[in-house]
């Protein structure tokens, strides 16, 4: 790497997760330096020869970039001077998971930090009333998950109830043969109640809520990445 500078600078990374087939960001910040031409950013991945990305003298240098990252990476060039060394990663693959190192050299010194990048698939669930069923039921669907998640139902009225006996969950492999569509049906639901469909794997947790009354149906969904942060 060959770094000059007498002092160590603070470099901070955040553990993050990438959604397979989507674009992701590997976060890294450092002590700002207004001298852009003196900043060197190197991203490395454990077990990979060559670089993930290099930015120096105010521009990218991809001459040492590993083939698996070709055409897939970029730093936020206009934000480098304010200490942003985060890396954009196009079309996240399962094989992108691993330990990355963000190396920084500036006129103030040098520093590095590691980052654990998890990859998988996660998506918002959508709950609908299944009017085709013989009894009133709810259908919870989420298009893309990996690894295979667990699915659980809960209800505001019957808190703590186990709905495994009155629900049926299936996992259907998507066309790219990695991610799966999650479908869970909850039977024998009652109106004037709020039901929650919770989908979770080791990367993300998603919850879909539905409130069914005589006059309306209200829905809400949320997605939370697990173990994200410094």
């Amino acid at each position: 790497f060959g770094i000059s500078g007498k002092h160590f600078i603070t470099v901070t990374t955040f553990t993050s997760a990438g959604n397979i087939g989507e674009d992701g960001t590997l976060s890294c910040t450092f002590e700002p330096d207004i001298k852009l031409n003196g900043i060197v950013i190197q991203w490395l991945k454990e077990g990979i020869k060559g670089l993930v990305h290099e930015f120096k003298e105010g521009k990218d240098d991809l001459s040492q970039q590993h083939e698996m990252f070709r055409g897939r990476t970029a730093v936020f060039a206009d934000q480098v001077v304010v200490g942003n060394a985060s890396l954009r990663l196009k079309n996240v693959q399962l094989t992108d998971a691993g330990t990355y190192t963000c190396y920084i050299r500036t006129s103030k010194g040098k520093g590095n930090a590691n980052l654990e990048y998890k990859t998988g698939a996660f998506s918002m669930p959508e709950i609908n009333v299944d009017y085709n069923a013989s009894s009133e039921s709810l259908r919870c669907e989420a298009p893309r998950w990996f690894p295979q998640p667990t699915v659980a139902w809960a209800s505001q009225v019957d808190q703590g109830a186990n709905f495994s006996e009155v629900s049926n969950t299936s996992f259907e492999l998507n066309s790219e043969n990695v991610t799966m569509k999650v479908v869970s049906v909850l039977y024998n639901v009652t109106i004037n109640n709020t039901y929650s469909c919770m989908i979770e794997n080791d990367i993300a947790k998603a919850t879909g809520d539905i409130k069914v009354t005589d006059s309306e149906v209200k829905r809400r969904s949320q997605l939370q990445l697990l173990n994200s942060g410094p």
Partner: antibody
Framework: QLQLQESGPGLVKPSETLSLTCTVS??????????WGWIRQPPGKGLEWIGN???????YYNPSLRSRVTISVDTSKNQFSLKLSSVTAADTAVYYC????????????WGQGTLVTVSS | EIVMTQSPATLSVSPGERATLSCRAS??????LAWYQQKPGQAPRLLIY???TRATGIPARFSGSGSGTEFTLTISSLQSEDFAVYYC?????????FGGGTKVEIK
């Protein structure tokens, strides 16, 4: 302003090798954030990406053409070149060179294109 | 490879009217899509990248939208110089692929 210009023979015989050169002016081919690509367009048809090269010499080719394509770079002349071997009439097309972003990977600008006809 | 399908093949529009061009990908390309304009005898010209970001010097009447598999190029008020063929291109994964094009002609 950056400009690209294709050059090479307009007529190539079947089974021979098509050779084209793209000369870059108004900027350096060593600009780090870009690849340099080739795209072709058969008469009256759509566009097909052939492949690209980085100034350091690393290449990536369209799998459909990989066995016949070679792209090379000469940084001292600010040029990059395309060779396509064992050509047939199906390779008759307008061949364009273009600057390709390292990511996002859009093509801009393009050369004006050169028509290469494969015929005996 | 990802197949890009454009519709309609030909669009007849009067000057001053709005033109809406569609591009569909055979699988999700996120926002990794570009649009180009090509006039007869000329090279394509970049209009939009990142699905919605206008390239330098492109008039505001050109706008792009969409993500995943469905994309749209809208020309809000067609000028005489806008009659051309328009191509979409995905750069989500190698090999990069183009749609078959939409010809915008004068009605």
């Amino acid at each position: 302003q950056l400009q690209l210009q294709e050059s090479g023979p307009g007529l190539v015989k079947p089974s021979e090798t098509l050779s084209l050169t793209c000369t870059v002016s108004g900027g350096s081919i060593k600009s780090g954030s870009y690849y340099w690509g080739w795209i072709r367009q058969p008469p009256g048809k759509g566009l097909e990406w052939i492949g690209n090269i980085y100034y350091s010499g690393s290449t990536y080719y369209n799998p459909s053409l990989r066995s016949r394509v070679t792209i090379s770079v000469d940084t001292s002349k600010n040029q990059f070149s395309l060779k396509l071997s064992s050509v047939t009439a199906a390779d008759t097309a307008v061949y364009y060179c273009a600057r390709e972003g390292s990511y996002p990977n859009q093509f801009d600008p393009w050369g004006q294109g050169t028509l290469v006809t494969v015929s005996s | 490879e990802i197949v890009m399908t454009q519709s309609p093949a030909t669009l007849s529009v009067s000057p001053g009217e709005r033109a809406t061009l569609s591009c569909r990908a055979s699988q999700s390309v996120s926002s990794n899509l570009a649009w180009y304009q090509q006039k007869p005898g000329q090279a394509p010209r970049l209009l939009i990248y990142g699905a919605s970001t206008r390239a330098t010097g492109i008039p505001a009447r050109f706008s792009g939208s969409g993500s995943g598999t469905e994309f749209t190029l809208t020309i809000s008020s067609l000028q005489s110089e806008d009659f051309a063929v328009y191509y979409c291109q995905q750069y989500h994964s190698f090999p990069f692929t183009f749609g078959g094009g939409t010809k915008v002609e004068i009605k």
